[in-house]
């Protein structure tokens, strides 16, 4: 049994780190493998993660962790029974992938404006809470040529779009993702998309 692609891990900077790797051949990850992890810290204990399959040769493990601080460093050992397949380390603060924003809602009852709101995925006491900026992707299922990214660089999880900039009488979809500039994170996954119908019509005089 051999590791083809070594485990690569990212932390959500809250309670979970996700490690993914590929094996040299088809593997029943949960039956054959264990990922052991231990914080490099006085009197810490070894904890075990049971991986799941992620495609034929891929495995993924969700490591439960405490709140992340910059000093945290974990040793990782990938075992197949009594055989040590791989040994490495992981510093969560240096490999952060934020959680995806949630509760994306579109408000179309605001005059001349489409208002999009969503929720910050972190509690106020988390360091990432005040560091997230967002990208909102809006596209049309009726007009494949229309797709826009709006960068939200302010803290408030809202975006206002003049309804007049969207075509009337067609449906749009939106999704949002986040990243934290000061923590040099990757982008989060996209939130689930939400759909709305743009019924806005310009006043008669402006037509």
């Amino acid at each position: 049994m051999k590791v083809l692609q070594e485990p690569a891990c990212v932390s959500d900077y809250m309670s979970i780190s996700t490690c993914e790797w590929k094996m040299g051949g088809p593997t029943n990850c949960s039956a054959e493998l264990r990922l052991l992890y231990q914080l490099v810290f006085q009197s810490s204990e070894t904890h075990t993660c049971v991986p799941e399959n992620n495609g034929g040769v891929g495995c993924v493990c969700h490591l439960l962790m405490d709140d992340v601080v910059s000093m945290d460093n974990y040793t990782l050992d990938l075992w197949a029974g009594q055989q040590l397949l791989w040994k490495g380390s992981f510093k969560p603060s240096e490999h952060v992938k934020p959680r995806a924003p949630g509760n994306l809602t579109v408000h179309t009852n605001v005059s001349d404006t489409v208002l999009l709101t969503w929720s910050n995925p972190y509690p106020p006491d988390n360091y990432l809470y005040n560091d997230l900026t967002y990208a909102v992707n809006i596209w049309s299922e009726n007009d494949p040529a229309y797709s826009r990214i709006h960068n939200v660089t302010y803290l408030k999880p809202t975006l206002r779009i003049p309804a007049s900039t969207l075509k009337s009488g067609i449906s749009y979809r939106a999704r949002v993702r986040a990243w934290a500039q000061h923590y040099n994170t990757t982008w989060s996954e996209w939130s689930p998309s939400t759909k709305w119908y743009n019924s806005y019509r310009e006043p008669f005089e402006q037509r």
Epitope: L39, Q42, S43, S44, E45, V69, S70, D72
Partner: antibody, heavy 125, light 112 residues
Framework: EVQLVESGGGLEQPGGSLRLSCAGS????????MTWVRQAPGKGLEWVSS????????YYADSVKGRFTISRDNSKNTLYLQMNSLRAEDTAVYYC??????????????????WGQGTTVTVSS | DIVMTQSPLSLPVTPGEPASISCRSS???????????VDWYLQKSGQSPQLLIY???KRASGVPDRFSGSGSGTDFTLKISRVEAEDVGFYYC?????????FGQGTKLEIK
């Protein structure tokens, strides 16, 4: 009531061996790291050894490394210190103390918040 | 190894007066914000040590509020706002950041 009771001290000749025990009660013993601290007559406190709650990680002072072994039996709620190749400078009162909660991912520290009454070890010919 | 240096080694105090003991570590014992791995212990004559302060400034259960701890990184202080006769004994700081744990030399507090 949270309590630690040491036993096993006594008089031993240089080069001899002793095994100290520390019985814990009133708390979930296996969840906590444990520590041994000693105090030579008229001297200050000296850390000797620590062990994680699951017994998987052990730590020793340089002065006892290779001679002393810390262990625990969580089924008996008991901590041990096996002392071999004893020297005159090992003469001291030995205390066990409850250390950090080590079953969490990052051990939670509340100080050495419970101490035993101490057991006296005298090494002399 | 981290070295813990305590001062003064002897502290005569009048009852009702404040007292202060300093402890300096040879390297930082700060793991993360608010988590300085320094404790303060009191050992009264003929007794086992008892915990007063942990993590630099957190008062242990049952410890009177006249005891307080402060400091961060490498410099720490134990303060007694009004010394009482029962406070006599040896005071030790200890770093629990990493093994080997190290105690300071001890400060003998006595009543004038």
């Amino acid at each position: 009531e949270v309590q630690l009771v040491e036993s096993g001290g006594g008089l031993e000749q240089p080069g001899g061996s002793l095994r100290l025990s520390c019985a814990g009660s009133g708390f979930t013993f296996r969840d906590f790291a444990m520590t041994w601290v000693r105090q030579a007559p008229g001297k200050g406190l000296e850390w000797v050894s620590s062990v994680s709650g699951d017994g998987g990680n052990t730590y020793y002072a340089d002065s006892v490394k290779g001679r002393f072994t810390i262990s625990r039996d969580n089924s008996k709620n008991t901590l041990y210190l096996q002392m071999n190749s004893l020297r005159a400078e090992d003469t001291a009162v030995y205390y066990c103390a409850k250390d950090r909660l080590s079953k969490t991912i990052r051990p939670r520290y509340y100080g050495l918040d419970v101490w035993g009454q101490g057991t006296t070890v005298t090494v002399s010919s | 190894d981290i070295v813990m240096t305590q001062s003064p080694l002897s502290l005569p105090v009048t009852p009702g007066e404040p007292a202060s003991i300093s402890c300096r570590s040879s390297q930082s014992v700060l793991y993360s914000i608010g988590y300085n791995y320094v404790d303060w212990y009191l050992q009264k004559s003929g007794q086992s040590p008892q915990l007063l302060i942990y993590l630099g400034n957190k008062r242990a259960s049952g410890v009177p509020d006249r005891f307080s701890g402060s400091g961060s990184g490498t410099d720490f202080t134990l303060k007694i706002s009004r010394v009482e006769a029962e406070d006599v004994g040896f005071y030790y700081c200890m770093q629990a950041y990493q093994s080997p744990y190290v105690f300071g030399q001890g400060t003998k507090l006595e009543i004038k």
